[in-house]
Interface confidence: low
């Protein structure tokens, strides 16, 4: 049962797993969490009658009913964790803490102007944790605008404390606000030489680096693979860090792999997300159940419906055993990783989806695409929508993009002469437009955001955001698509496909089912020589092919160019502009998302 | 086939009023833009007014005495043309299109255009 609401003057007794500092019963709750194990906490907040020292503490704890006696007491607050909530979670907290220093390693010092500027700077330094910064009124004089940058073995402060005019709070990088690089490659072959802050056992290289990933201190990993020769070491996942943050050695060895924290990319990657089965590998943690089930799916789901199930191992029914059903072990662990994997025993193994919810919807993988024609098939490209103007009369305006439950990206031209959100409507789900009849529902718009620096879409600044007045229920034909990570700048993609129910030539009309063309991503510097007579800046990014012949074209506009990387989605991508449709050596001209993730963000995330 | 067919042009002295009648075929949706667009002998051809999503918009030198309509559910467009001008001789051309605004009403833009009716102003 899902219960968010805090309890007041309110403490569960017992079941402690261990103690945390938090600045607020909030964040108390979302480090719970995250906590592998943690289903209900009390956090103490400060009170006159409470001892200072246990002031900001966060007791995480378990209970095998999943829940504890209550007691009343004053200045504590209760609840539950997040994990029996089917709702997405963030670990983003963008609070700013007056008054409070949270204590951690101070590794940074250094002047900042602001604790906006402090808070940046502790964002895009891949140590830090969290910040204190001294105001200018701070009464030491030297201390003044002093920017602390901090970390902890835990992510958490050691300690947190009341002083007078400071202010603290955490890194963004949770928030995809970081414009540190996200390196996605792993690297075979490949032992980091570095310090290991801590080791876990791993079915593979990716789900040890999505563990490193959300563990707070490590940087980068190296996983032996279970060929590995020492046997007491395979499958083991090493979590490490260096002072620099960059592996300072690099060791060939065989059936060795490693790879770096996604942590700058972890908005537009699964992370938590570990979905993939494991044959003939047997899990081995501390036993919560023994069910029935009649496959290793369905094993899954009675893990992935049970909150303290971790991960599991199925083994198939004996021929003619158990109305062939076979056994589910459902299993957890300290760490919510196996103490042990073993190979050859005939199980099928995998880990709980309930951690799914804490990745980016966007990141879910979609049915497989038809390739090659141009008509689209229903649920390929469910981030599609269709913007529909109703004054004078109904009719298609423009395409968009889903990429949150309340938010449409698509391009600022496409309002021009649109006075009032009210005459627009968003259908999502949509793959013919003689679908849309008089009693099909739509999404209102309750806000138009158009970028302040747009004046024409040939000078760039062609996006906008309009804010839907009711929420997206995400289905197989209508759920977001990833923004890319500012980390990915210097990705090259070469799986992209622009979509729309536009023009398929200059003198065409608007097209019933939705279209497909994949194209070539074009340099700016080529595009550049095409249009001799334009700016192509780097906020725009240019796709065609050199004969011409594929292009997006009217009635496209604002609709996405949706590129592949490792097996993501991501929106690269604003039709924008174009001379012609489809001419040779005349690419199509697109708003360059990853230069305006931080006003998508802003604009999104604003309170 | 998208067909534009105007009609309504002819003769008429200065001061005069005539109304011109758009009419498209061939086409699904309604357009988001339709245009009046006139051509004089020997000159280019010029904007003279359009309607895009139900907002007007018009060249300065027929302000006040042209107005542009438009009627969806029969797809048409009109234009009424009062306190005509000898200036405003020329043959009028309707244009229509699922034009998103590109900085300029009067660009080339348009993919549809009609055959055009001659409208002459004597003094």
């Known amino acids: 049962e899902c219960v968010t609401q805090l309890l007041k003057d309110t403490c569960f007794e017992g079941g402690d797993i261990t103690t945390v500092f938090t600045p607020s019963a909030k964040y108390c709750q979302v480090v719970c969490t995250y906590h592998p194990r943690c289903l209900l906490f009390t956090f103490t907040a400060e009170s006159p009658s409470e001892d200072p020292t246990r002031w900001f503490t966060c007791v995480l704890k378990d209970s095998v009913t999943e829940t504890l006696p209550r007691v009343n007491r004053t200045a504590a607050i209760s609840g539950y964790s997040f994990k029996q909530c089917s709702h997405q979670i963030s670990a983003c907290n963008k609070d700013i803490y007056v008054d409070l220093d949270m204590k951690g390693i101070n590794y940074n010092s250094s002047v900042a102007k602001s604790a906006q500027e402090c808070q940046e700077r502790c964002t895009d330094d891949v140590h830090c944790h969290f910040f204190t910064y001294a105001t200018r009124q701070f009464p030491s004089l030297e201390h003044r605008n002093i920017c602390l940058l901090k970390h902890t073995q835990t992510g958490t402060p050691t300690r947190i404390t009341k002083l007078d005019k400071v202010v603290s709070g955490f890194s963004l990088k949770s928030c995809a606000l970081s414009n540190l690089a996200c390196i996605r490659d792993i690297f075979p072959n490949t032992v980091f030489a570095d310090s290991n802050i801590d080791s876990v056992m791993a079915p593979d290289a990716f789900v040890c680096g999505r563990i490193c990933t959300h563990h707070p201190g490590c940087l980068f990993f190296t996983f032996f693979s279970q060929e590995w020769p020492k046997e007491s070491q395979r499958n083991l996942c090493l979590l490490k860090t260096s002072e620099s943050g960059l592996p300072s050695t690099r060791i060939k060895k065989s059936k060795a792999l490693s790879g770096f924290s996604l942590q700058s990319c972890r908005h537009s990657i699964p992370v938590f997300c570990h979905s993939s089965f494991y044959h003939d590998t047997d899990f081995l943690g501390e036993e919560l159940d023994i069910v029935a089930a009649k496959s290793h799916e369905a094993c899954q789901k009675l893990c992935t419906n049970a909150v303290r199930c971790q991960f599991f191992t199925y083994t198939p029914a004996q021929a003619s055993c158990n109305e062939g059903k076979g056994k589910c072990y459902l299993k957890l662990s300290s760490n919510g990783s196996p103490t042990k994997i073993l190979h050859g025993r005939g199980g099928i193994s995998g880990y709980t989806l309930r951690l799914c919810k804490m990745d980016n919807e966007c990141t879910t993988k979609i049915k497989p695409r038809i390739v090659g024609g141009t008509a689209s098939v229903r649920g390929e490209w469910p981030w599609q929508v269709t913007l529909h103007t109703t004054s004078p009369t109904q009719r298609h305006l423009c395409g968009g993009s889903i990429i949150g439950n309340q938010w449409i990206l698509t391009a600022a031209h496409c309002f021009y002469g649109v006075e009032s959100p009210k005459i627009l409507r968003v259908y999502s789900g949509i793959l013919n437009q003689s679908e849309i009849k008089e009693d099909t529902s739509f999404f209102g718009v309750q806000e138009i955001i158009i970028h302040d620096q747009y004046k024409m879409a040939e000078s760039g600044y062609d996006i906008a955001l309009l804010k839907l007045e009711t929420t997206v229920n995400y289905t197989d034909s209508q759920r977001p698509i990833c923004l890319p990570s500012k980390g990915d700048r210097n990705v090259i993609y070469t799986d992209c496909w622009v979509t729309g129910w536009g023009y398929r030539k200059l003198r065409d009309k608007i097209q019933n089912t939705l279209q497909k063309a994949k194209i070539p991503l074009v340099t700016n510097e080529e595009c550049q020589k095409r249009y001799r007579g334009h700016k192509i800046t780097h906020k725009m990014i240019c796709a065609g092919y050199r004969e011409g012949g594929k292009d997006a074209c009217k009635g496209d506009s604002g609709g996405p160019l949706s590129c592949k990387h490792n097996e993501v989605w991501h929106l690269v991508g604003i039709t924008s502009w174009g001379e012609g449709c489809a001419q040779r050596e005349r690419p199509g001209v697109y708003t360059n998302v990853v230069e305006y993730v931080d006003w998508i963000l802003e604009k999104t995330q604003a309170v | 086939q998208v067909q534009l067919q105007e009609s309504g042009g002819g003769s008429v002295q200065a001061g005069g009023s005539l109304r011109l009648s758009c009419a498209a075929s061939?086409?699904?949706?309604?357009?988001?833009?339709m245009g009046w667009f006139r051509q004089a002998p020997g000159k280019e051809r010029e904007g003279v007014a359009v309607?895009?999503?139900?907002?007007?918009h018009y060249a300065d030198s027929v302000k006040g005495r042209f107005t542009i309509s438009q009627d969806n559910a029969k797809n048409m467009v009109y234009l009424q043309m009062n306190s005509l001008k000898p200036e405003d001789t020329a043959m009028y051309y309707c244009?229509?299109?699922?034009?998103?605004?590109?900085?300029?009403?009067?660009?080339?833009?348009?993919?549809?255009w009609g055959q055009g009716t001659q409208v002459t102003v004597s003094s």
């Open positions: 244009a229509a299109d699922l034009l998103e605004y590109d900085g300029t009403w009067f660009g080339s833009t348009y993919n549809y």
């Open positions: 061939g086409y699904t949706y309604s357009f988001n833009s």
């Open positions: 309607i895009y999503l139900g907002s007007t």
